[in-house]
Interface confidence: low
């Protein structure tokens, strides 16, 4: 006999990295027929939504009107159909950016290299942080961590054309509070045509994801949850 439902999917729109004071929507997708969704933050209940009609809705949205360090952290969601609860979703790490200062990103030996050359990125920030993050723009949004008092190095090793793309770095004040992004550095890796065709650059995010990051969320997402209007708020699992 099945004791739990499959776990829902959780993600942030438009992105998990949210500049402070900007808007973000946390989405939780479960099953049609789910009568209740709970969003949990750092282990305690954060919000509840009851879709109407449940049989026609399989996704709910929790709107955060202006992001700050208080809202940054780990989120998960669960849903129930009747009395049966789902497994919890994977954890969503929601990060607040544009905190305090802007790091400087540089690349050695330079932004234009040939395939096989060793490349190292350097991220520098003079204020109190010891963790740095290097991100390559693209759908995968791969994050590398580096450590250092005021500067971290990110050796990429011998590069291929797959390393081509735009990079930025952040200083991290804690796991979920990052600095302003550095100015972008575009790495151009030249190589033979065959390699290039085998390893195309990651598809990039829409233009608003970097720099401005966020466009105004549709007013339809700014729904009035009236969070005090439910009894399940103290049914923490």
């Amino acid at each position: 006999q099945q004791q739990t439902l499959p776990k829902p999917f959780i993600w942030a729109e438009p992105h998990f990295m949210v500049p402070k004071e900007k808007q973000v929507t946390i989405c939780c997708q479960g099953n049609y027929g789910a009568v209740e969704y709970q969003l949990h933050f750092e282990g305690s209940l954060f919000a509840v939504d009851r879709p109407k009609p449940p049989e026609r809705i399989n996704k709910v949205q929790f709107y955060i009107p202006d992001m700050n360090s208080r809202m940054a952290g780990q989120y998960s969601c669960i849903y129930r159909v009747g009395e049966l609860w789902s497994e919890p979703s994977n954890l969503l790490d929601l990060v607040v950016t544009e905190m305090y200062d802007t790091p400087t990103l540089s690349v050695h030996p330079g932004p234009e290299v040939i395939s096989g050359e060793k490349v190292t990125f350097y991220c520098r920030l003079d204020t109190a942080t010891s963790m740095f993050l290097l991100l390559k723009e693209g759908r995968s949004s791969h994050v590398q961590r580096g450590y250092g008092k005021v500067q971290a190095e990110f050796p990429l090793g011998p590069v291929t054309t797959a390393h081509r793309g735009t990079y930025r770095c952040f200083g991290s004040y804690n796991n979920h509070a990052w600095s302003f992004p550095s100015e972008p550095v575009k790495l151009l890796v030249t190589g033979d045509i065959e390699n290039t065709s085998l390893a195309p650059e990651d598809p990039t995010f829409p233009a608003d994801t970097w720099g401005t990051y966020l466009l105004t969320t549709e007013t339809g997402l700014q729904k009035d949850h009236a969070l005090w209007d439910h009894t399940a708020q103290n049914l923490l699992r």
């Epitope: 933050f41 750092e42 282990g43 305690s44 209940l45 954060f46 919000a47 709107y63 009107p65 202006d66 208080r70 700014q222 009035d224 949850h225 009236a226 969070l227 005090w228 209007d229 708020q233 103290n234 923490l236």
Partner: antibody
């Protein structure tokens, strides 16, 4: 910078009425649930009333239910508390407070309501 | 309603002292507890929420701990500006309820 500024307090006789206002600035007012919290002289904090972002849902402490009405005008970024049938035990400093998931992250400076004959 | 009980109701301490205030809930509230500081004639100020998360801009000498029914606010090294009244508040269910307060006075 988030700012909440209360006004409308004063001296009123038992059975009288008073309307408090709270002018909000520095944040998207309509997106936030708001509350009134009061503090009798020399006493602790007591939650009074809650209103959702749209104004569609309101809640009251048992001690004021039926006498107080919370409302908001999102076009004016203003929160209100209409207090009727006032009693001596309603004497307090009234704070408007922004709520974020059940705790109060920003408070106004408070306005004193004195109910006395 | 969930009842919140703070202890002690007042305490005297010196600058540099480590100060601990406790708060007990009448039923389990997970980690849904906030702490506020209030100085005479001023509005309360949020210090800690979710039992242990420090509000932005609050000095790191303040810390919170606990889960379930028993919670603690600790000031690791009391500073002159810390003499005030401290309140706990459960943000687990409605109505939100406060402890009766703990006044921290200069010894």
């Amino acid at each position: 910078e988030v700012q909440l500024v209360e006004s409308g307090g004063g001296l009123v006789q038992p059975g009288g009425s008073l309307r408090l206002s709270c002018a909000a600035s520095g944040f998207t007012f309509s997106s936030y649930e708001m509350n009134w919290v009061r503090q009798a002289p020399g006493k602790g904090l007591e939650w009074v009333s809650y209103i959702s972002g749209s104004g569609g849902s309101t809640y009251y402490a048992d001690s004021v239910k039926g006498r107080f009405t919370i409302s908001r005008d999102n076009s004016k970024n203003t929160l209100y508390l209409q207090m009727n049938s006032l009693r001596a035990e309603d004497t307090a400093v009234y704070y408007c407070a922004r709520v974020w998931r059940f705790y109060f992250d920003y408070w106004g400076q408070g306005t004193l309501v004195t109910v006395s004959s | 309603d969930i009842q919140m009980t703070q202890s002690p109701s007042s305490l005297s301490a010196s600058v540099g002292d480590r100060v601990t205030i406790t708060c007990r809930a009448s039923q389990g509230i997970s980690n849904a507890l906030a702490w506020y500081q209030q100085k005479p004639g001023k509005a309360p100020k949020l210090l800690i929420y979710a039992a242990s998360r420090l509000e932005s801009g609050v000095p790191s000498r303040f810390s919170g701990s606990g889960s379930g029914t028993d919670f603690t606010l600790t000031i690791s090294s009391l500073q002159p500006e810390d003499f005030a009244t401290y309140y706990c508040q459960q943000h687990y269910s409605t109505p939100p309820t406060f402890g009766q307060g703990t006044k921290v006075e200069i010894k």
